[in-house]
Amino acid sequence: VPEKSVRWCAVSEHEATKCQSFRDHMKSVLPSNGPSVACVKKASHLDCIRAIAANEADAVTLDAGLVYDAYLAPNNLKPVVAEFYGSKEDPQTFYYAVAVVKKDSDFQMNQLRGRKSCHTGLGRSAGWNIPIGLLYCDLPEPRKPLEKAVANFFSGSCVPCADGTDFPQLCQLCPGCGCSTLNQYFSYSGAFKCLKDGAGDVAFVKHSTIFENLANKADRDQYELLCLDNTRKSVDEYKDCHLARVPSHTVVARSVGGKEDLIWELLNQAQEHFGKDKSKEFQLFSSPHGKDLLFKDSAHGFLKVPPRMDAKMYLGYEYITAIRNLREGTCPEAPTDECKPVKWCALSHHERLKCDEWSVNSAGKIECESAETTEDCIAKIMNGEADAMSLDGGFVYIAGMCGLVPVLAENYNTPNPNCENTAEEGYFAVAVVKSSSDLTWDNLKGKKSCHTAVGRTAGWNIPMGLLYSKINHCRFDEFFSEGCAPGSEKNSSLCKLCMGPSPNLCEPNNKEGYYGYTGAFRCLVEKGDVAFVKHQTVPQNTGGKNPDAWAKNLKEEDYELLCLDGSRKSVQEPANCHLARAPNHAVVARKDKADCVQTLLLDQQRMFGSSVTDCSSNFCLFESKTKDLLFRDDTVCLAKLHDRNTYEKYLGEEYVKAVTNLRKCSTSPLLEACTF
């Protein structure tokens, strides 16, 4: 059956032979209606990439550099299955390219000029492409030929496989630049030995190199890693201090109509029958015909790449930056230490319009990028299409798990001038009901619920976390009879109450009328029994404070708070009647952009912050007629975080624990991708 067939692309006679054997052996173990293998032979991996894009083949396994080529237009391929190494219990699908130095040296990443460098080999990922790609814009001009620019940047190097005649400085630390183990400084162990012997000041290797060469922790403690933010960390902190995370070997397919489920079904069955130590007749991860045919011989199995993970996310911002610099050879005109405009990520068109107005008023210091959901915005910040946005705590958690960092906190209670340096305790997550109802915290089952959005703190994580510990399952859509929780599955009962309009029904952005704090309260006013919001929501939308038709006649006393002990209290008493304290919303960014974002935002709030009194004829950053566009409307200022500069420290142990527990109920495709 052609639609059940996976056309595997082979790049040599030997691969084609193994592919035919793969095809025949899979036929013998799979049912006739199951997936089948067909083999397509091409001259090179690039030809395979083109063939898949043209729908002449379906899959091929590629090294990281080729995954980058496969992702570029017009190919537009995406990773679907990853090879893993090590054990099934602790599968390794990535390695980390690192810069190792001796602990007793005193320079940082931005002080490498004039140092001596040790590389694994010319053109190799960890030893050359990544470090030189990331340093590319610091190299002296002209940057071509690249070897000459590198020779002039370092004071001496060992770059195995380089041309020692044309570029003698690259072979200064290893005469002749031998391209095999005859050169004592060749490859990973050699580059590390070059550093260890004192020949070089820095070695560009894999994170595992240090552990493979130094079994003794005391010896390893003599070395450190250089981080991209110009700090240092110990060698076992490579996950937080590396030049790039590099995928090892990956199966790619078309982004649209790519048969990824079929490819996974095929490879999953293949590893069951012909994986490591499974069969004498045919081995997936070895071959009598040659090395690394179709798959790496060192692979132990396959893992499905989460569907939300596109090539940009899979390869990572640092890796793509390095490879793009090397390939395109272009550098920004401004020096790299100068802050370029900050690209703010706006949710849908309401936020985009406010962002555009901010952009005009900032004289272009702010630029705007749009996405339809918060998770799409986070992904854009991760891959460099955007730089920053302000997020509810639930999304600060997801952003943190995806490698972003909190930069500034929204403050709601501290009057100026102390505001900028004050760390507030947070706001209260509350459950609001109509005074006329007889609801309590203990009889919510079967009622109609209103939520700000799935994954947000007051509207979801806190109430559903508390509910989970009571009901011990994740079927929240069965607990409530119906509700509006934007971001839920469209056919879920938790989308039934949403107002839309139609194509935007239950979407987690302002196009859905019941989205956010104000939206969830409106949902309660018009349709629901209980709304999960922040403690300020009712006062901010009653007594004529919200001029919209649905809100202008609402009275604060017509609403009450549910307390966890089963009682109810006035909305004026949130301190004595709340579900939990929630961390304030915070601005997040990539680590490399955090300082620029902070500096620019502090400057912008001085011009457009809460000191502006007349928002009808001036631009106000923290005002959007109760719509909470870009920032919460009740923000007084954006405040420095001081030492709370990681998502764990910012959110606090208790909240992180609560969200981590809720992860078993997670519907976040982005979180799944970021924890792959």
Epitope: H350, L353, K354, V360, A363, K625
Partner: nanobody, 117 residues
Framework: QVQLVESGGGLVQPGGSLRLSCAAS????????MAWYRQAPGKQRELVAG???????TYAGSVKGRFTISRDNAKNTVYLQMNSLKPEDTAVYYC???????????WGQGTQVTVSS
């Protein structure tokens, strides 16, 4: 809330010029930010240029150096001078004062600009 009416569009050859006008039904002196947007078929509406009351201007990267936004508060009009026009500038051009945009997508009729040989 003032009504805005766009005019000045038309068919022009590549390399040619046009001047768009946006006339307001009331005073724009107290309006902080005025801007021109455009929307090409099948594309999202995008900011082309903006101007604040104090005269601060911002331009989309694709029009920098070719387009100039200005405002005449006495005439309650905002202008967009478009030079060195390219086929990719073809779109409906809209003017906004941002006053109602936080509530709903309120836009006027716009004015069609077509750049073609």
């Amino acid at each position: 809330q003032v009504q805005l009416v766009e005019s000045g569009g038309g068919l022009v050859q590549p390399g040619g010029s046009l001047r768009l006008s946006c006339a307001a039904s009331g005073s724009i002196a107290s309006i902080n930010t005025m801007a021109w947007y455009r929307q090409a078929p099948g594309k999202q509406r995008e900011l082309v240029a903006g101007i604040t009351r104090s005269g601060t201007t911002t331009y989309a990267g694709s029009v920098k150096g070719r387009f100039t936004i200005s405002r005449d508060n006495a005439k309650n009009t905002v202008y967009l001078q478009m030079n060195s026009l390219k086929p990719e500038d073809t779109a409906v051009y809209y003017c906004t004062d941002y006053s109602s945009s936080y509530y709903q997508d309120y836009w006027g009729q716009g004015t069609q600009v077509t750049v073609s040989s």
